[in-house]
Amino acid sequence: TPEVWVQVQMEATELSSFTVHCGFLGPGSISLVTVSWGGPDGAGGTKLAVLHPELGTRQWAPARQARWETQSSISLALEDSGASSPFANTTFCCKFASFPEGSWESCGSLPPSSDPGLSAPPTPVPILRAD
């Protein structure tokens, strides 16, 4: 069964910078990826970026750079302009779609005990999954 993993990491050099890494584990080619924060996309979450393998990417603040790392994984750099760090307790969700076969979504957040530069383990936590 296809699964999605999500990692959130704080940059060691800039404590106001975060990077979200997401990947798809399964067969098939990915046709669209949506990254949201504050919850699943369309369920209280706010879109941060949409990535298409051929048409490019769209991103919204505070997303700084969305890019493909491999054909089945992406990264999204975030810039926290506030004095406090709201990203630390925020849930980030990634939805991978393989049109028209289906779509899969998982969420993750920065582990409470994370030191800067350390990332969450790539444990898949599917919250919405196509049958």
């Epitope: 046709s31 298409h52 779609a97």
Partner: antibody, heavy 120, light 106 residues
Framework: EVQLVESGGGLVKPGGSLKLSCAAS????????MSWVRQTPAMRLESVAT????????YYPDTVKGRFTVSRDNAKNTLYLQMSSLRSEDTAIYYC?????????????WGQGTSVTVSS | QIVLTQSPAIMSASPGEKVTMTCSAS?????MFWYQQKPGSSPRLLIY???NLASGVPVRFSGSGSGTSYSLTISRLEAEDAATYYC?????????FGAGTKLDLK
Amino acid sequence: EVQLVESGGGLVKPGGSLKLSCAASGFTFSNFAMSWVRQTPAMRLESVATIVNGGINTYYPDTVKGRFTVSRDNAKNTLYLQMSSLRSEDTAIYYCARHDDFLYYAMDYWGQGTSVTVSS
Amino acid sequence: QIVLTQSPAIMSASPGEKVTMTCSASSSVNYMFWYQQKPGSSPRLLIYDTSNLASGVPVRFSGSGSGTSYSLTISRLEAEDAATYYCQQWTSYPLTFGAGTKLDLK
């Protein structure tokens, strides 16, 4: 202006065959996934075939699998639906529709439809 | 396949009223769309990805929902809104539609 124009519908006997065409214009046809959707006399909408950009991958629901074949000619900007072993329940208006990637593959443009009647 | 159940099947409302119709899925869906169809015309995209308005759609239309429960709301009904509204998903193949909600104006 985006346009999708279906043709090829008509009256056919049960067990017969028919080939529908959808002529596309106003956009780069080869960049878009396309679907055939039918509307039954009861006004139900049913997806019967989907083909992605390159035309290699095709998808069908169980109701038409093995009987319908979707194909595309990107050079001619045309989508096709070959229907065989037709049954009375295939009677419907057949629409071709375009899927827009950045609209999460919503069907953002539809043709005017072509009517298919399967009856003896 | 995912079955979408729309309710009510038929509804009647007066111009200026707020109306809401629902779409319930047999299992959780990630992408929901709404289409409007008037008699003698092809379906027209209204809402994509649950809550985004398609180009040219009046702001009186809005969509919401998650998981298995979705809705389409028209804040102030106008005469031109008389139509049948369909929900559609593609979280898993085949793409499926609801049976529609027919909206009549009083």
